[in-house]
């Protein structure tokens, strides 16, 4: 079977409906909300996951930005339009014909406008900074152990190759994970950093997207790493276009 060997389920996405109606009676899974077929050997795109998660409450945040062009997902949940490959369409609109442009991780990168708003291309988020604060521990974690454990986690749980984990910074109690990935760097089968970051974010919040797998149990040399808060910053290949009004 394609999805799972014996019971027809999707290990990487519990927000799916699966049935053995694929070629040769193989298990095939479709994302809730969109009905699109998903590959259960890898992460489902963030766009399809957001579409399946329409009922979740808004989670608005305001953050101090690490650079003038960094974006934070302050708008919370919305029902996105996804393209046939499951990626965000560059222009998103709500039911009241308010439209805006988003980046490849679905975060708004322009002021809101009307139906005349043009978004020429989907701008790629090529750098993601995941900022974590961990709960107090007896002592600081060893930096190289922490680095190795996070690289292993991103490879084994999220299938992200370690080449895309650009750096792990640590100043107790703050951990920063830098993910970097240009369009040209992605080879066949490589997971998108935006999808990996989203799965990680949901894991940290105790809202795992994985089917039947336990929640995230992060340990460094046997010592539990418990996260108190997470901030995620997104940097696009082309800086966002907001009016000065928004910045004041």
């Amino acid at each position: 079977h394609t999805a799972a060997q014996d019971n027809c389920t999707c290990p990487t996405n519990k927000m799916t409906v699966c049935s053995p109606d694929g070629p040769g009676g193989r298990c095939q899974c479709r994302a809730l909300g969109s009905g699109m077929a998903v590959d259960c050997s890898t992460l489902t795109s963030k766009c399809l996951l957001l579409k399946a998660r329409m009922s979740a409450p808004k989670n608005a945040r305001t953050l101090v930005r690490p650079s003038e062009h960094a974006l934070v997902d302050n708008d919370g949940l919305y029902d996105p339009d996804c393209d046939p490959e499951g990626r965000f369409k560059a222009r998103q609109c709500n039911q009241t014909s308010v439209c805006w442009c988003v980046n490849s991780v679905g975060v708004r990168r322009t002021d809101k406008g009307d139906l005349s708003l043009r978004c020429d291309e989907l701008v790629r988020t090529h750098h993601i900074l995941i900022d974590l604060r961990h709960r107090p521990t007896a002592g600081a974690f060893n930096h190289s152990d922490l680095d190795a454990e996070l690289r292993r986690l991103f490879r084994e749980r999220y299938r992200l190759h370690p080449k895309f984990v650009a750096a792990v910074h640590y100043e107790q109690p703050t951990i920063q994970i830098e993910l970097r990935q240009n369009t040209s760097q992605k080879a066949a089968g490589d997971v998108d950093i935006g999808d990996a970051a989203y799965y990680f974010e949901r894991d940290i919040k105790g809202e795992s997207l994985f089917q039947g797998r336990g929640g995230l149990d992060l340990r460094v040399r046997g010592e539990p790493l418990q996260v108190e808060r997470t901030l995620i910053y997104y940097l696009d290949e082309i800086p966002p276009k907001f009016s000065m009004k928004r910045l004041t």
Partner: antibody, heavy 119, light 108 residues
Framework: QVQLVQSGAEVKKPGASVKVSCKAS????????MHWVRQAPGQGLEWMGE????????SYNQKFKGRVTITRDTSTSTAYMELSSLRSEDTAVYYC????????????WGQGTLVTVSS | DIQMTQSPSSLSASVGDRVTITCRAS??????LNWYQQKPGKAPKLLIY???RLHSGVPSRFSGSGSGTDFTLTISSLQPEDFATYFC??????????FGQGTKLEIK
């Protein structure tokens, strides 16, 4: 169709270096990982390292302790594997293989290059 | 590194037989297990990836199953061209990616 064509057999002396080439055709060279795997006579398969041709990123099997270097030339769609400080136990057939980023399966292989290390 | 152990290391069978080769990983590798066939003097060929997915052009008599640490390659009805050596390989962990030691399938 996808093809990986490797350079010919080599005979080297202990302590020398060897550089094996692998020319890819039939697909976009920069869109797939390239791996190198070796097989000593009558033995199993041993993964040596990988490269992403688009940006030249490499990672290696630590067993080779800096003796292996993988490079690529995108203008000719060719990958190279250089092994230095050769010893007799490096006598093997060396293969390049195209890889998938998620499954890490090697779906197409070169024909192999026999490297013999002998004094 | 993750160790991969195949069994048996060799086996004899006849054309038409159903044959099973097993592969065990030293730790959970989810479904990231691939199978290859190699004939003498030739490069390996991918048969099955991600435990059970058939590579293009591979006959349907080959199938794979398993999850976690225990995996199986099954040939439902042996054909003369199937006599070869079979290797499993894990693609789950950080590099290095590791292979089983091989199972030689011979004509009885």
């Amino acid at each position: 169709q996808v093809q990986l064509v490797q350079s010919g057999a080599e005979v080297k002396k202990p302590g020398a270096s060897v550089k094996v080439s692998c020319k890819a055709s039939g697909y976009t060279f920069t869109s797939y990982w390239m791996h190198w795997v070796r097989q000593a006579p009558g033995q199993g398969l041993e993964w040596m390292g990988e490269i992403t041709p688009s940006d030249g990123y490499t990672s290696y099997n630590q067993k080779f302790k800096g003796r292996v270097t993988i490079t690529r030339d995108t203008s000719t769609s060719t990958a190279y594997m250089e092994l230095s400080s050769l010893r007799s136990e490096d006598t093997a057939v060396y293969y390049c293989a195209r890889g998938h980023g998620n499954y890490v399966s090697f779906d197409y292989w070169g024909q192999g290059t026999l490297v013999t290390v002998s004094s | 590194d993750i160790q991969m152990t195949q069994s048996p290391s060799s086996l004899s069978a006849s054309v038409g037989d159903r044959v099973t080769i097993t592969c065990r990983a030293s730790q959970d590798i989810s479904n990231y297990l691939n199978w290859y066939q190699q004939k003498p003097g030739k490069a390996p060929k991918l048969l099955i990836y991600y435990t059970s997915r058939l590579h293009s052009g591979v006959p349907s008599r080959f199938s794979g199953s398993g999850s976690g640490t225990d995996f199986t390659l099954t040939i439902s009805s042996l054909q003369p061209e199937d006599f070869a050596t079979y290797f499993c390989q894990q693609g789950y962990s950080l590099p290095p990616y590791t292979f089983g030691q091989g199972t030689k399938l011979e004509i009885k």
